[in-house]
């Protein structure tokens, strides 16, 4: 067989589908690898061929499109399962070719089982809702293309094992689930089950997503530096260890990059010669507000180090702030014997 541009196994597209449910899988060639679409390819006389390698096998084999009730079929650039079986798991290849051109890509397909509460090894998308922000909606994902617009499916929403009905602040509205006012108690996994008829058969599509209730932009503030502050003075003798924590609170902000850094005499610690280490820890509140702590440490501080300016800086999409630490050299207490001697007029 002549040379074929082989894009290898596209593990970025780890496709997971539920057992005993319909699945439509588009050939990734047209979405991610080639600069033309299926229609262009088809009208140019190119043919799309599908084959697969079963799980734990090396042998590539053609896909059987002659199964009862057309369980597996191909339509344009889509491979259809109506429905999937557990042993459909494997690596699938779509190859576009004619006598002069060939391009192919493989991708893994995993058919997974779910239990009665929709728990499964499926990786779940996360949808963030703002706390106490007014009506917000989530939509049953990835159901386009399964049935024509003339078909009116029934949609049932669940939270875990339980059908969403009579909830205080959550209302199912067809493909949408409306949260009248999102609260922490609304955190969790939500499942929509879409049921539709096709050729005298009934199919179910199950889609689960995780809802995470996060801080509202209405309540967001610029970073708040809790430490250093004006109430704490870092008073050290030369030779002692200097430890200064910079603790900053960041409101949750969607897609915001939170940054904390120290400057010493206006320079980044990496740009100066003193032996300084910085350790960072991060914690999150239940609404994903963030507290970052960076501890600046100088093992054996010198009197020169104690004269420097140590400033903690913080930045988020809401603004930038800075706070200097109060550092000073401890004045040694007068030695007892000297003081006593002077008191008695000794020379």
């Amino acid at each position: 067989s002549e040379r074929c541009d082989d894009w290898g196994l596209d593990t970025m597209r780890q496709i997971q589908v539920f057992e005993d449910e319909p699945a439509r899988i588009k050939c990734p060639l047209f979405e991610h690898f080639l600069k033309f679409n299926y229609s262009t390819a088809h009208s140019a006389g190119l043919t799309l061929i599908w084959y697969w390698t079963r799980q734990d096998r090396d042998l590539e084999e053609p896909i059987n499109f002659r199964l009862p009730e057309n369980r597996i079929s191909k339509e344009k650039d889509v491979l259809w399962f109506r429905p999937t079986l557990l042993n459909d798991t494997g690596n699938y290849t779509c190859m576009l070719r004619n006598t002069t051109y060939c391009s192919k890509v493989a991708f893994p397909l995993e058919v997974v089982q779910k239990d009665s509460c929709f728990n499964s090894p499926m990786k779940l998308p996360v949808h963030k809702l703002y706390i106490e922000y007014g009506i917000q909606r989530i939509t049953c994902p990835n159901v386009d293309g399964y049935f024509p617009s003339s078909v009116k499916p029934t949609i049932t929403w669940y939270m875990g094992c339980y059908k969403i009905q009579n909830f205080n602040n959550v209302i199912p509205e067809g493909m949408n689930l409306s949260f009248l006012i999102a609260l922490i108690s609304n955190n969790g996994n939500y499942t929509c089950v879409v049921t539709y008829p096709e050729n005298g058969r009934t199919f179910h599509l199950t889609r689960t997503l995780t809802v995470k209730v996060v801080g509202s932009p209405k309540n967001a503030v610029p970073p708040v530096i809790h430490s250093p502050n004006d109430h704490v003075v870092y008073e050290k003798e030369p030779g002692e260890e200097l430890l200064i924590p910079c603790t900053v609170y960041f409101s949750f902000l969607m897609d915001s990059r939170n940054e904390v850094w120290w400057t010493i005499d206006g320079k980044k610690p990496d740009d100066i010669t003193i032996d300084v280490t910085i350790n960072e820890s991060i914690s999150h509140s239940r609404t994903e507000d963030e507290t970052r702590t960076q501890i600046l440490s100088i093992k054996k501080v010198t009197s020169e180090d104690l004269k420097r300016s140590y400033v903690c800086h913080a930045r988020s999409a809401k603004g930038e702030v800075a706070k200097a630490a109060k550092v000073k050299q401890k004045v040694p207490a007068p030695r007892y014997t000297v003081e006593l001697a002077c008191g008695f007029g000794a020379t």
Partner: antibody, heavy 122, light 107 residues
Framework: QVQLVQSGAEVKKPGSSVKVSCKAS????????IQWVRQAPGQGLEWMGY????????DYAQKFQGRVTITADESTSTAYMELSSLRSEDTAVYYC???????????????WGQGTLVTVSS | EIVMTQSPATLSVSPGERATLSCRAS??????LAWYQQKPGQAPRLLIY???TRATGIPARFSGSGSGTEFTLTISSLQSEDFAVYYC?????????FGQGTKVEIK
């Protein structure tokens, strides 16, 4: 350690109502459901309905629709089951039960209350 | 609603012997089946869920098997504390339903 403590035995007249309480201690922060199940003398177990206290969601078995009301007071971690229009065949031990979360398949009756005997007699 | 049928209604077994209890569903419940033990004057106790997974603290002599419509609870060597009534319950479809119970008594 999560525990469910139910209210004491009741004797009721036919046609009246009974309200049984179920107080949860050591409740987790995550939402959970309280189930109600009854058992007539010498008979099997019969599921009546559930409530999710923190979310307000509830559902009842078809057989009890219109006669049963399940409520909850989140502030006291207490669920209630009220059965109206009582008849002699409602004489039973009424149990509440729960799981740790809303997500554990098959473990929604993990922890049980001690049961409340309701006797309906004229 | 799914009807759960248990057999036998009563099982007479000597201590140390094996007991096999059956539960049949009127339609497939996959592996969404639980078993409970109930002693006189006590609330039921969860033994098995997912047809074969032992609940926390349940001894290894209790085992469950089956899927679809036919299920079995086996007690490999009956102890005196195992004489009780056993119920199966499906949680595949609402409403969740229980079997009528099997009483395991001393022979």
């Amino acid at each position: 350690q999560v525990q469910l403590v139910q209210s004491g035995a009741e004797v009721k007249k036919p046609g009246s109502s009974v309200k049984v309480s179920c107080k949860a201690s050591g409740s987790p922060a995550e939402p959970y459901a309280i189930q109600w199940v009854r058992q007539a003398p010498g008979q099997g177990l019969e599921w009546m309905g559930y409530i999710i206290p923190s979310l307000g969601g509830y559902d009842y078995a078809q057989k009890f629709q219109g006669r049963v009301t399940i409520t909850a007071d989140e502030s006291t971690s207490t669920a209630y089951m009220e059965l109206s229009s009582l008849r002699s065949e409602d004489t039973a031990v009424y149990y509440c039960a729960r799981g740790q979360t809303l997500y554990e398949s098959g473990r929604q009756f993990d922890i049980w209350g001690q049961g409340t005997l309701v006797t309906v007699s004229s | 609603e799914i009807v759960m049928t248990q057999s036998p209604a009563t099982l007479s077994v000597s201590p140390g012997e094996r007991a096999t209890l059956s539960c049949r569903a009127s339609q497939s419940v996959s592996s969404n089946l639980a078993w409970y033990q109930q002693k006189p004057g006590q609330a039921p106790r969860l033994l098995i869920y997912g047809a074969s997974t032992r609940a926390t603290g349940i001894p290894a002599r209790f085992s469950g098997s089956g899927s679809g419509t036919e299920f079995t609870l086996t007690i490999s060597s009956l102890q005196s504390e195992d004489f009780a009534v056993y119920y199966c319950q499906q949680y595949n479809n609402w409403p969740w339903t229980f079997g009528q119970g099997t009483k395991v008594e001393i022979k």
